[in-house]
Interface confidence: low
Amino acid sequence: DPVLCFTQYEESSGKCKGLLGGGVSVEDCCLNTAFAYQKRSGGLCQPCRSPRWSLWSTWAPCSVTCSEGSQLRYRRCVGWNGQCSGKVAPGTLEWQLQACEDQQCCPEMGGWSGWGPWEPCSVTCSKGTRTRRRACNHPAPKCGGHCPGQAQESEACDTQQVCPTHGAWATWGPWTPCSASCHGGPHEPKETRSRKCSAPEPSQKPPGKPCPGLAYEQRRCTGLPPCPVAGGWGPWGPVSPCPVTCGLGQTMEQRTCNHPVPQHGGPFCAGDATRTHICNTAVPCPVDGEWDSWGEWSPCIRRNMKSISCQEIPGQQSRGRTCRGRKFDGHRCAGQQQDIRHCYSIQHCPLKGSWSEWSTWGLCMPPCGPNPTRARQRLCTPLLPKYPPTVSMVEGQGEKNVTFWGRPLPRCEELQGQKLVVEEKRPCLHVPACKDPEEEEL
């Protein structure tokens, strides 16, 4: 299906920038891995590069404003022609749910005191209002609560005095039209407007003030324009050469508004002075190689020794990584393909252990499924032997760090009937629904 192709992908917002054009295939658009595409206008923007996870979104607001609730955040697999870690397809959302508490207590209503005395009338003539007040302290509200109803009330009051009415101008009437609309007749055109002292008229008893200023205004019609000439387009110029050497680019044609040139305020030519076309080099753009993540460390061994496990004998181990995705003369991966380190093997070694403190509470699982729970653990943690942390393997090469490697067999006293892991689980409260934020915007 055709897509909208863009020249930039903005990592921070996940938005497509620099529209190149529509009606091209994803494969053609993604000849350049710096480009991005949308399946429809306003839809999800996917970059052409290898897929990887976006940053986590900010945590959504807590599902309740007081006491314990839950909140969600998400990240999205973005990219093309591959999968994110975990074999996840582009467009997929991953969710996290955690417990939250904006405010420990919930608000409690207060009660009103009795009404205070009435204040004086708000005006000295005609009718006004007067006000009385009461306090929200009987009892005072708790934890940000409030009292129901109003802290003050008003009623009408009458001073029994008539107020004077001062005169005010109504709005100006329209200017009388000038005798001509473009250049020079035999007389100098004038325009006039008037207004009335009627908004309102001044009162007689008690006497109000008259309107200040003049009831008429006159001016000359100056700067009448010469009669206008509308502009017209000249022919389209030549098509510019394709500006790129690989993938898709954009060529342009231009025309000038000079057939004729607009004069005396006549309108400029309608439409665009430039038009663009997509040009296709049909050449794929170079793709630089990217290192895969490191592989597992190989077993810790020492040459010419059958086993060094559970002994104070340093060995060596290595791990490798693969340079993937290099195509069309892109750059090779920088750095080493193999990593070597010194190690002590504690694989399957029976070691004395001790129980860890409780871990922090984990995320609520499943975040989008029924009845999510969170858990914490205490682990039987092995006490590592006190072997030297560095060794000198070859004369003149200095000290090298030595790392413990392998999965030992820790021994702890039984705790709650368990030998290795003690787990505590709790349900997550006030769980909100998982909704795709892209679909919420529509």
Epitope: P367, C368, G369, D436
Partner: nanobody, 129 residues
Framework: QVQLVESGGGLVQAGGSLRLSCAAS????????MGWYRQAPGKQRELVAD???????NYADSVKGRFTISRDNAKNTVYLQMNSLKPEDTAVYTC???????????????????????WGQGTQVTVSG
């Protein structure tokens, strides 16, 4: 987006049969599993039956042997054939679809699912005693 439209509901005597249909339109290439839910007044919504894109089915214990779910991929339609209907089958029946995105999401989370993210409007089924 996927749109789901149910049909085939109505009033039927106990022991009778009905066939519900749910037609999908829109981004139908995005659909993985499809299923039927029901909700009786004052009760929780419950899964009746569902069927994956490969055709494997799953039924609630209360309808096993009486209801059959099937899928016509060419017509983008899922059916629920309901036989030996009982008064306790009276409910609003709603069709649901799970997107491929949600199915990948739940596999990653280790949740057996399906996680339905598209829903129809529902059709009323009334079984009289």
């Amino acid at each position: 987006q996927v749109q789901l439209v149910e049909s085939g509901g109505g009033l039927v005597q106990a022991g009778g049969s009905l066939r519900l249909s749910c037609a999908a339109s829109g981004s139908i290439f995005d659909i993985n599993a499809m299923g039927w839910y029901r909700q009786a007044p004052g009760k929780q919504r419950e899964l009746v039956a569902d069927i994956t894109s490969s055709g494997s089915t799953n039924y609630a214990d209360s309808v096993k042997g009486r209801f059959t779910i099937s899928r016509d991929n060419a017509k983008n339609t899922v059916y629920l054939q309901m036989n030996s209907l009982k008064p306790e089958d009276t409910a609003v029946y709603t069709c649901a679809a799970e997107s491929i995105r949600e199915s990948q999401n739940r596999h990653q989370l280790g949740y057996m699912g399906p996680l339905y993210d598209y829903w129809g409007q529902g059709t009323q089924v009334t079984v009289s005693g």
